[in-house]
């Protein structure tokens, strides 16, 4: 895992108001884990960052992610109506200048170094789910969520009309 000491010094000052020209309504430094309490960790391998889903050893520190929350009007073609109101979007940054990105072609979730303003692929619609969980839906691909597949994060298509278990797209946020 990387970036723990750096992330703890990672203050709001590092995230200025230039992201898509708007300021986050708030920011939250949290560890990210799955519904089954596996930790999301980040490792530097061959000069690029890899994202893992793993059980941590007892005293191992969890990696932290800076979540920046934004208000956004929901596009009417996605929600099925024009009066859906505002929703919350989020960007996730585990270390300075790197953000989680949706790679829709590869159905993968990647860490990319980015200039601001961030591209749409770095934004996710935040869903408030029960059991103190959230889900992250791709801004660029409605109905596609960050999920867990083979101990990695992946993009998973979710059809609201299908009867399937969605535990693999549920995540917990924790300050500890």
């Amino acid at each position: 895992a990387f970036g723990i000491s750096g992330v703890q010094k990672y203050t709001r000052a590092l995230h200025d108001s230039s992201i898509t020209g708007i300021s986050p309504i708030t920011e939250y430094l949290a560890s990210l884990s799955t519904y089954n309490d596996q930790s999301i960790t980040f490792a530097l391998e061959d000069e690029s960052y890899e994202i893992y889903v793993e059980d941590l050893k007892k005293d191992e520190k969890k990696d932290k992610v800076l979540l920046s929350y934004y208000e956004s009007q929901h596009p009417s073609n996605e929600s099925g109506d024009g009066v859906d109101g505002k929703m919350l979007m989020v960007t996730l940054s585990p270390t300075k200048d790197f953000w989680l990105h949706a790679n829709n072609k590869e159905h993968s979730v990647e860490l990319h170094k980015c200039e601001k303003p961030l591209p749409d692929q770095a934004f996710f619609v935040l869903h408030n789910m029960h059991s103190n969980c959230v889900s992250f839906e791709c801004k660029t691909d409605p109905g596609v969520f960050i999920g867990v597949k083979d101990n990695h994060l992946a993009l998973i298509k979710v059809d609201s009309s299908e009867n399937l278990c969605t535990e693999n797209i549920l995540f917990k946020l924790s300050e500890t």
């Epitope: 708030t26 939250y28 996605e78 099925g80 009066v83 859906d84 619609v125 408030n128 029960h130 009867n163």
Partner: antibody, heavy 121, light 111 residues
Framework: EVQLVESGGGLVQPGGSLRLSCAAS????????MNWVRQAPGKGLEWMAE??????????HYAESVKGRFTISRDDSKNTVYLQMNSLRAEDTAVYYC????????????WGQGTLVTVSS | DIVMTQSPDSLAVSLGERATINCRAS??????????LNWYQQKPGQPPKLLIF???SQGSGVPDRFSGSGSGTDFTLTISSLQAEDVAVYYC?????????FGQGTKVEIK
């Protein structure tokens, strides 16, 4: 136009049953969590029940005051949500609102006009 | 259950003046770094209408004179310059935990 239209209210005796319906139109019904909220005459709002989506296995949640007596359900093919109310009591007298949570489930942003349920002998 | 208590129960304010409504939760309604606190306006004979969500974000189409603030257990709804059409009952609601609970309401009238 986004609309929720409640029906099924009326006068019922204590101990009786009633089924409220809420017909939704103007949006993709199957994408939204649905709620029932009630308001006794001259009183405040009270959240009653919620139902999630098919891919959430239609999970339901209830206020303690109606748990075991009221059942929320939905039929996505008919764009309709229901509230089955059994063992009705005088204190259940209220206007019952059908309500839709927004995309992402942060707040209620679409309400019906309400249907009045009166429990009296 | 989280108990929501509003103050005052009623409020009479002159047109153009500021109106302030307070809402206190029996325990923190913060989660995920946000406050799960919404404000609704209800006019006579109508269903409620969302004004503010996550404590301080304005709902769509809500006039700028309505603003929300606070975190944890203490929250405020402010109408910066009261208009005649703002006469209504205002409710806070927590959506952190089930059951979602509302405050008892604050009636705002013109002085």
């Amino acid at each position: 136009e986004v609309q929720l239209v409640e029906s099924g209210g009326g006068l019922v005796q204590p101990g009786g049953s009633l089924r409220l319906s809420c017909a939704a139109s103007g949006f993709t019904f199957s994408n939204y969590w649905m709620n029932w909220v009630r308001q006794a005459p001259g009183k405040g709002l009270e959240w009653m029940a919620e139902i999630t989506l098919k891919f959430n296995n239609y999970a339901t949640h209830y206020a303690e005051s109606v748990k075991g007596r009221f059942t929320i359900s939905r039929d996505d093919s008919k764009n309709t949500v229901y509230l089955q109310m059994n063992s009705l009591r005088a204190e259940d007298t209220a206007v019952y609102y059908c309500a839709r949570r927004n995309y992402g489930n942060w707040y209620i942003n679409v309400w019906g006009q309400g249907t009045l349920v009166t429990v009296s002998s | 259950d989280i108990v929501m208590t509003q103050s005052p129960d009623s409020l009479a304010v002159s047109l153009g003046e500021r109106a302030t409504i307070n809402c206190r939760a029996s325990e923190s309604v913060d989660k995920f770094g946000m406050s799960f606190l919404n404000w609704y306006q209800q006019k006579p004979g109508q269903p409620p209408k969302l004004l503010i969500f996550v404590a301080s974000s304005q709902g769509s189409g809500v006039p700028d004179r309505f603003s929300g603030s606070g975190s944890g257990t203490d929250f405020t709804l402010t109408i910066s310059s009261l208009q005649a059409e703002d006469v209504a009952v205002y409710y806070c609601q927590q959506s952190k935990d089930i059951p979602y609970t509302f405050g008892q309401g604050t009636k705002v009238e013109i002085k």
